[in-house]
C-alpha cells in the first residue's frame, strides 16, 4: 500500500435545503483508471461510511440507490456533493481515495472538510 | 442491449494456441474494462486477467504470464484472449464478462456465453 | 490475494425452504462482496452486490448479508428454479477471486 495527498476544503456551510458541496483532490501518482472514493464522517471520535463509489476515469460516479451522495469526476478531482443533511449531521466528513487499478495500489486520505448544517427556522403560520 | 458474442468451441493439440474472440456491442466500448475467466470441468471460476480497452493496457494472473495475451480491436468492438503452449489442464470454459460498478463495488454484470476449449492429443 | 471460501460444497434442499450459504474472506474485504448464480452450461448470473444489494431482475427471496470476513446468501423459499450452484466474488482488492461454489440440488 502507498501513500498518495489528498485535498480538500477545511469548511463548508450547508445550504438552507442541506445540501453540502465540495471538491476532494488527488495527487495521482500513477496512471490510475479505477477509483475509489469513499466519505467518511468523524464525530465524537467515531467514524463512520457516509458513501462511496468505484469508477472508471472519465465514466460518472454512481453511487447506490438509497446513498444521500451524488458526485462527478474530472482529472484527479472529485467533485461531492452530500444532501439530505440536518443539524445533527454537522461534523468533519474526510475523503478517502483509492487508485485500485492498474497495481500497484494507493491510498490517500485528506484531512476532512467540517461541514456546518443549521436547521432552517420553521415558518410561523400565517393567516390569509 | 449490452451483449457479448464468443466464439464457437476449439478442438487444440497440446503445445498449441488457441486465440477466443469477444465482440462488444450495446455500449460504448472502451467505458468499461473486460475480464478473462475460465472454468475447469466441474471446477469453480478462474480469473485470468483484464484489458482496458481505452488504451488496450492489460493484467493478468500470475499464472498465465508468459503464455496468455489479450487484445483488442477498437474498429470491430472486439476483444481477444489468446493462450499458448496449451496442455490439457486448459481444458475449459473460457469466459469473457464486463465489469461494472455500482456505488463502492465491482461486478460482473454481463458475460459472454463462453467458448469451450478442448486440450487433446 | 484474498481467499473465499464456501460452504457447504452442496446441499440438498425441497422447493419450499429456506436455503443459506455462508461465504468466508481470508482478509476483511468491507461489504465488497457478490453473489452468483450458474446453471449447467451456462455462465454465470449476478445476484447480489456490494453484499446486500439485489441486482436488477433477481426476484427478492434471494437476500445478502454480512461484512468484513463473514457473508451469508439467502433463499427464502427455493423455487425449482433455483436448483444450481452459487459463487461469491470479493471485490475489495484486485485480483478477483471467487469462492469454490456451492451446489444447490433437489433433495
Known amino acids: 500500500c502507498k501513500a498518495m495527498h489528498v485535498a480538500q476544503p477545511a469548511v463548508v456551510l450547508a445550504s438552507s435545503r442541506g445540501i453540502a458541496s465540495f471538491v476532494c483532490e488527488y495527487a495521482s501518482p500513477g496512471k490510475a483508471t479505477e477509483v475509489r472514493v469513499t466519505v467518511l464522517r468523524q464525530a465524537d471520535s467515531q467514524v463512520t461510511e457516509v458513501c462511496a463509489a468505484t469508477y472508471m476515469m472519465g465514466n460518472e460516479l454512481t453511487f447506490l440507490d438509497d446513498s444521500i451522495c451524488t458526485g462527478t469526476s474530472s482529472g484527479n478531482q472529485v467533485n461531492l456533493t452530500i444532501q439530505g443533511l440536518r443539524a445533527m449531521d454537522t461534523g468533519l466528513y474526510i475523503c478517502k481515495v483509492e487508485l485500485m487499478y492498474p497495481p500497484p495500489y494507493y491510498l490517500g486520505i485528506g484531512n476532512g472538510t467540517q461541514i456546518y448544517v443549521i436547521d432552517p427556522e420553521p415558518c410561523p403560520d400565517s393567516d390569509f | 442491449q449490452v451483449q457479448l458474442v464468443q466464439s464457437g468451441a476449439e478442438v487444440k493439440k497440446p503445445g498449441a494456441s488457441v486465440k477466443v474472440s469477444c465482440e462488444a456491442s450495446?455500449?460504448?466500448?472502451?467505458?468499461?474494462?473486460i475480464h478473462w475467466l475460465r472454468q475447469a470441468p466441474g471446477q469453480g471460476l478462474e480469473w485470468m486477467g483484464i484489458?482496458?480497452?481505452?488504451?488496450?493496457?492489460?493484467t493478468y494472473a500470475q499464472k498465465f504470464q508468459g503464455r496468455i495475451t489479450m487484445t483488442r480491436d477498437t474498429s470491430t468492438n472486439t476483444l481477444y484472449m489468446e493462450l499458448s503452449s496449451l496442455r490439457s489442464e486448459d481444458t475449459a470454459i473460457y469466459y469473457c464478462?464486463?465489469?461494472?460498478?455500482?456505488?463502492?463495488?465491482?461486478?460482473?454484470?454481463?458475460w459472454g456465453q463462453g467458448t469451450t476449449v478442448t486440450v487433446s492429443s | 490475494d484474498i481467499v473465499m471460501t464456501q460452504s457447504p460444497s452442496s446441499l440438498s434442499a425441497s422447493v419450499g425452504d429456506r436455503v443459506t450459504i455462508t461465504c468466508r474472506a481470508s482478509?476483511?474485504?468491507?461489504?465488497?462482496l457478490n453473489w452468483y448464480q450458474q446453471k449447467p452450461g451456462k455462465a454465470p448470473k449476478l445476484l447480489i452486490y456490494?453484499?446486500?444489494s439485489l441486482q436488477s431482475g433477481v426476484p427478492p427471496r434471494f437476500s445478502g448479508s454480512g461484512s468484513g470476513t463473514e457473508f451469508t446468501l439467502t433463499i427464502s423459499s427455493l423455487q425449482p428454479e433455483d436448483f444450481a450452484t452459487y459463487y461469491c466474488?470479493?471485490?475489495?482488492?484486485?485480483?478477483?477471486?471467487f469462492g469454490q461454489g456451492t451446489k444447490v440440488d433437489i433433495k
Open positions: 484489458i482496458n480497452p481505452s488504451g488496450g493496457s492489460t
Open positions: 456490494a453484499a446486500s
Open positions: 466474488q470479493q471485490a475489495n482488492s484486485f485480483p478477483p477471486t
Open positions: 450495446g455500449y460504448t466500448f472502451t467505458n468499461y474494462y
Open positions: 482478509q476483511s474485504i468491507s461489504s465488497y
Open positions: 464478462a464486463r465489469r461494472d460498478c455500482r456505488g463502492p463495488s465491482c461486478y460482473f454484470a454481463y
